[in-house]
């Protein structure tokens, strides 16, 4: 359910998708991993307003509670919904293989 | 993957699942919900320090850029693995009916 | 060094179009947020308009909707502002901006501030 | 009219602390962070705090922000000549759909 796709705090700062350039070395893959050199990280970042593209139920009961005890529950928190596959050749024994990971890139955000 | 179940902040303090006691004026539910008055939420709270409880390769990723460049990628996020049904009694136009909700209860937590 | 440089200012009659440029440098371009903020001789800041690092979300100020449109291209690390049907009440130095990327500790959100300004382009419209 | 409510003025003397102060409502100043600007003469703005009370690397400790309820203020201690400027405070109004300044205030060294 996306519940409210509009952001209170201002444009951009509420949960979406975001494009952070890594090399394999800031992502420590340098000793297996050949190619890409660099990888186009796609993550969930941003705040979770009230039912702002709420994931599901439990998001919804952690907004309310959160309202009422901020100290005790935190907001939900932006998270991937869905990923894109993506192709890494990775060094090996005998040489190099392709391998698809389907959890690396974030495709879709919501807040749970 | 459950990488890494050894909270280094202290017992307690990482990412796991916690009982909140919830009425339905609480949660904003007493207009369409007979029953529970009262619901055990049971949530995600805690830190998410590296490696601890990753989801996938994608918190991985997010720990180690965090790591790098705290100020532009948050840490990963403790949240729900997995959920508990719950069933409610709801009020409808003619009476009552029961309503399984599976997506309310977190039953185990992970960070991502 | 992290810099942003308008240009496209001048001269224009009312009712008549231009197109400001911002030249970004010294920093991924496109990564962040970026704004246009206005200045009126002797006057306060006006907030213009804004655009999401990847085009896909843009706002308006109520005074410029319709006239104005914010654009990027980000494979030549440049903001645009095209600004039509325009009016003596638009003349102004108009500067560029772009929106700081810092996320707060725990709520993981982007601070809602311009943290790199430009010189400014001036504006004006009269016949 | 601006949307935020600032002092048009204010004055002190060197080494003396002076304090501006933003007025706004539940829709912006009320429900969102503020961000404070200094615009030296005949320069472009600079941000100073954002986020109600952070400064960015580079900017002194004499200046720091606050903000209680709809109101927020910029404090400013140990007065220099060089803080002579015009002081914006911004905040996003979501009733609005816009990012609202303050009318400025110029501040006087004597």
């Known amino acids: 359910a996306r519940n409210g796709d509009h952001c209170p705090l201002g444009p951009g700062r509420c949960c979406r998708l975001h494009t952070v350039r890594a090399s394999l070395e800031d992502l420590g893959w340098a000793d297996w991993v050949l190619s890409p050199r660099e990888v186009q990280v796609t993550m969930c970042i941003g705040a979770c307003p009230s039912q702002f593209r709420a994931a599901n139920m439990h998001a919804q009961i952690k907004t309310s509670l959160h309202r009422l005890k901020p100290d005790t529950v935190p907001a939900p928190c932006c998270v991937p919904a869905s990923y894109n596959p993506m192709v890494l050749i990775q060094k090996t024994d005998t040489g190099v293989s392709l391998q698809t990971y389907d959890d690396l890139l974030a495709k879709d955000c919501h807040c749970i | 993957a459950r990488n890494g179940d050894h909270c280094p902040l202290g017992p307690g303090r990482c990412c796991r699942l916690h009982t909140v006691r919830a009425s339905l004026e609480d949660l904003g539910w007493a207009d369409w919900v007979l029953s529970p008055r009262e619901v055990q939420v049971t949530m995600c709270i805690g830190a998410c320090p590296s490696q601890f409880r990753a989801a996938n390769m994608h918190a991985q990723i997010k720990t180690s850029l965090h790591r790098l460049k705290p100020d532009t990628v948050p840490a990963p996020c403790c949240v729900p693995a997995s959920y508990n049904p719950m069933v409610l009694i709801q009020k409808t136009d003619t009476g009552v009916s029961l309503q399984t909700y599976d997506d309310l209860l977190a039953k185990d937590c992970h960070c991502i | 060094e992290v810099q942003l440089l308008e240009s496209g200012g001048g001269l224009v009659q009312p009712g008549g179009s231009l197109r400001l440029s911002c030249a970004a440098s010294?920093?991924?371009?496109?990564?962040?947020?970026m704004s246009w903020v206005r200045q009126a001789p002797g006057k306060g800041l006006e907030w213009v308009s804004w655009?999401?690092?990847?085009?896909?979300?843009?706002y308006y100020a109520d005074s410029v909707k319709g006239r104005f449109t914010i654009s990027r291209d980000n494979s030549k690390n440049t903001l645009y502002l095209q600004m039509n049907s325009l009016r003596a009440e638009d003349t102004a130095v108009y500067y560029c901006?772009?929106?700081?990327?810092?996320?707060?500790?725990?709520?993981?959100?982007?601070?809602?501030?311009?943290?790199?300004w430009g010189q400014g382009t001036l504006v004006t419209v009269s016949s | 009219q601006s949307v935020l409510t600032q002092p048009p003025s204010a004055s002190g003397t060197p080494g003396q602390r002076v304090t501006i102060s933003c007025s706004g409502s539940?829709?912006?100043?009320?429900?969102?962070?503020v961000t404070w600007y200094q615009q030296l003469p005949g320069t472009a703005p600079k941000l100073l705090i954002y986020?109600?009370?952070h400064r960015p690397s580079g900017v002194p400790d004499r200046f720091s922000g606050s903000k209680s309820g709809t109101s927020a203020s910029l404090a400013i201690s140990g007065l220099r000549s060089e803080d002579e400027a015009d002081y914006y405070c911004?905040?996003?109004?979501?009733?609005?759909?816009?990012?609202?300044f303050g009318g400025g205030t110029k501040l006087a060294i004597l």
């Open positions: 911004g905040s996003w109004d979501y009733s609005l759909n816009a990012y609202v």
């Open positions: 655009i999401s690092y990847d085009s896909s979300s843009k």
């Open positions: 539940s829709s912006n100043i009320g429900s969102n962070d």
């Open positions: 901006a772009r929106y700081g990327i810092k996320t707060r500790t725990n709520n993981a959100y982007y601070a809602n501030a311009m943290d790199v």
């Open positions: 010294g920093f991924t371009f496109s990564s962040y947020d």
């Open positions: 986020d109600d009370s």
